[in-house]
Amino acid sequence: EVEKTACPSGKKAPEIDESLIFYKKWELEACVDAALLATQMDRVNAIPFTYEQLDVLKHKLDELYPQGYPESVIQHLGYLFLKMSPEDIRKWNVTSLETLKALLEVNKGHEMSPQVATLIDRFVKGRGQLDKDTLDTLTAFYPGYLCSLSPEELSSVPPSSIWAVRPQDLDTCDPRQLDVLYPKARLAFQNMNGSEYFVKIQSFLGGAPTEDLKALSQQNVSMDLATFMKLRTDAVLPLTVAEVQKLLGPHVEGLKAEERHRPVRDWILRQRQDDLDTLGLGLQG
């Protein structure tokens, strides 16, 4: 805590500018008006303040807004955002996507910090659901964001938002998460034709039940092996050799190379040897 000291004569800051970098911490505290700082926050980012000086500026804003900063200030925090604690951020009410983008930009290239996680949480709760524009923004900054949510949180994602999801956004999702997302994706893409539908639904198929896989096998989809191996084991096991052959098309040849991995191994053990022989791969059931 910086002691309250009078501002020396002639040192009172008429505006936020580069001259302030030469101020000592106590001078910043005494000579910079908090209300002026709040209205000229956009200038702070362009000035090479030290971390200690930023601490002082944050302290001034905290005093001015003990109940939490207004969005007009939050939007222009820039690198000062990195000084905020999750407790500070919980006091905020961020409603603008532009504000969210501005703050995510500050943390770009780094892993999701507790501050960012709190900010996103506040923003999404404020909106009531994870809409398409928000999801677009969040996955652009954090491709793993969707898979960091619990199945309960994912249940608030409306099917319309699924259009914003890219295949790489689902890379780290576990089966429980895909179980929630798959029905939403199925609903979102239901009006697409066969081949286009498969391209879109492919990344979500780790949540697909057996009957949907059987239906896909009738559509000449040629599912690649990497997708097949992400399917739920319990959904794959009831499939017949003929269905798997139709589902994978030319990629069925790769089963031989993956015969020791699940769900391939478990599926092979369920099949009759005569049926496996038709695959022409020398697989032993």
Epitope: L225, A226, K230, G249, H251, E253, H261, L281, G282
Partner: antibody
């Protein structure tokens, strides 16, 4: 040792067809798929398609769908590729190759299309 | 279709030198479930058929000398010949078997001084 034997050369006239053979030996013919690959001088390698010798199922590169027809004769452990409506663009070396990794390649057949 | 890009297109080296050639794919070839990359390297000596050197990006085919080393994951792959021998004069191709149609790189021609 495992071998895929192909005839050395085929000289054919434009518009005609040719049936290339690939005779497998020293392995279970029905336990590996057979692939066919085209190589033109200075043009790299192109995958034409594959066939499952066990049931005759075929898969083609879209580019060769109306050009190549793959078949097998299990009794002689031989894979065939018929090329139709030949033009000078079809002049190339054609290889058969075994299995998912193409772990064994045929000796190659040079097809020359010329009047 | 997955596009495979090899570089350089040609290389000239002396016997005993280390050689590195690159292969890049337009999409990831990694099967995250088995942690295998569906990429193979082939050697084609003048007037001969191609021969499998490496599969799954880094698994050496039996009988291939251990100076041939494959590495990489996702979209970027490398074939290293740790100490080039005169008999390594050849074209080297990479190929993806992640999805059909199977596609090959344009090749790297290795010439030896």
């Amino acid at each position: 040792q495992v071998q895929l034997q192909q005839p050395g050369t085929e000289l054919v006239k434009p518009g005609a067809s040719v049936k290339l053979s690939c005779k497998a030996s020293d392995y279970t013919f029905t336990s590996y798929w057979m692939h066919w690959v085209k190589q033109r001088p200075g043009q790299g390698l192109e995958w034409i398609g594959s066939i499952n010798p066990s049931n005759g199922d075929t898969y083609y590169n879209e580019k060769f769908k109306n050009k190549a027809t793959l078949t097998v004769d299990k009794s002689s452990s031989t894979a065939y590729m018929q090329l139709s409506s030949l033009t000078s663009d079809d002049s190339a070396v054609y290889y058969c190759a075994r299995g998912w990794y193409f772990d064994v390649w045929g000796t190659g057949t040079t097809v020359t299309v010329s009047s | 279709d997955i596009v495979m890009t090899q570089s350089p297109s040609s290389l000239t080296v002396s016997v005993g030198q280390k050689v590195t050639m690159s292969c890049k794919s337009s999409q990831s070839l990694l099967n995250s479930s088995s942690q295998k990359n569906y990429l193979a390297w082939y050697q084609q000596k003048p007037g001969q058929s191609p021969k499998l050197l490496v599969y799954f990006a880094s698994t050496r085919e039996s009988g291939v000398p251990d100076r041939f080393i494959g590495s990489g994951s996702g979209t970027d792959f490398t074939l290293i010949i740790s100490s080039v021998q005169a008999e390594d004069l050849a074209d080297y191709f990479c190929q993806q078997h992640y999805s059909t149609p199977r596609t090959f790189g344009g090749g790297t021609k290795l010439e030896i001084i």
